[in-house]
């Protein structure tokens, strides 16, 4: 089937980085500057994305792949292919319409992005608080109060803190 298709459609032989040029008897021509084709058999090349302004070039465009952008420091990428830049906050803060605001008591954020999340409730797992939470860090749960009675075995290692979620992409 592949051989038959090649005989019927000479364009299928054009590799990535070229296009099938109808103006030149369907021969494979290289993509012009600032354009690319990431797959074979294409009849046109796509225009390269330009990373302008606060969008910085992370990867230059080549004849076979589009440019990739990221955001100027102080902001981070959001959306497919870094279609948006969203501002960073400090740890212990979350982003709101009013800008970066401190996490409310009882919540934390250990990243520069995302939302403040409630501290782990150690008592739900029958454990005690070993290290208090802060705006930047979750509480650390220790052994249950019963484990701390005299003669009890050595302290069990704290349960790993739940990984905070990320802002929507």
């Amino acid at each position: 089937f592949e051989r038959t298709r090649s005989l019927q459609d000479p364009c299928s032989n054009c590799p990535a980085g070229t296009f099938c040029d109808n103006n030149r008897n369907q021969i494979c021509s290289p993509c012009p500057p600032n354009s690319f084709s990431s797959a074979g058999g294409q009849r046109t090349c796509d225009i390269c994305r330009q990373c302008k302004g606060v969008f910085r070039t992370r990867k230059e465009c080549s004849s076979t792949s589009n440019a990739e952008c990221d955001c100027t420091p102080g902001f981070h990428c959001l959306g497919a292919g870094c279609s948006m830049c969203e501002q960073d906050c400090k740890q212990g803060q979350e982003l709101t319409k009013k800008g970066c605001k401190d996490c409310c008591f009882g919540t934390f954020n250990d990243q520069k992005r995302g939302i403040c999340r409630p501290w782990t409730n150690c008592s739900l797992d029958g454990k005690s608080v070993l290290v208090n939470g802060t705006k930047e860090r979750d509480v650390v749960c220790g052994p249950s109060p019963a484990d701390l009675s005299p003669g009890a075995s050595s302290v069990t290692p704290p349960a790993p803190a739940r990984e905070p979620g990320h802002s929507p992409q």
């Epitope: 959001l78 279609s83 948006m84 830049c85 969203e86 709101t96 802002s167």
Partner: nanobody
Amino acid sequence: EVQLVESGGGLVQPGGSLRLSCVASGFTFSTHWMNWARQAPGKELEWVANINQDGSEKYYVDSVEGRFTISRDNANNSLYLQMNSLRAEDTAVYYCARGGVGYGDSHFGMDVWGLGTTVTVSS
């Protein structure tokens, strides 16, 4: 083509005023939150202010609250930043930026940015 073009930057003395403008084209301006952000020399990009679609909600970074005023004119596809009582630390490139679809609900990402206008506050 979707585009934002800033103007109005320049050299001003401390305590002076300046009004920045941003003209939008290629999209329905009145359906988007709009923002100003700035980048001072050697510093990270910083959000400055935003305004909702009809201008009824406006928010500012603490450092400019009471000195800067953001406004918009949907009939003329224009965004403004009135800057009063300017200080040396306000020296920066100021960018106009469009809030992406869903801005304020699911994210605060800005998808279209101008190339900036330079404000220098110096005596």
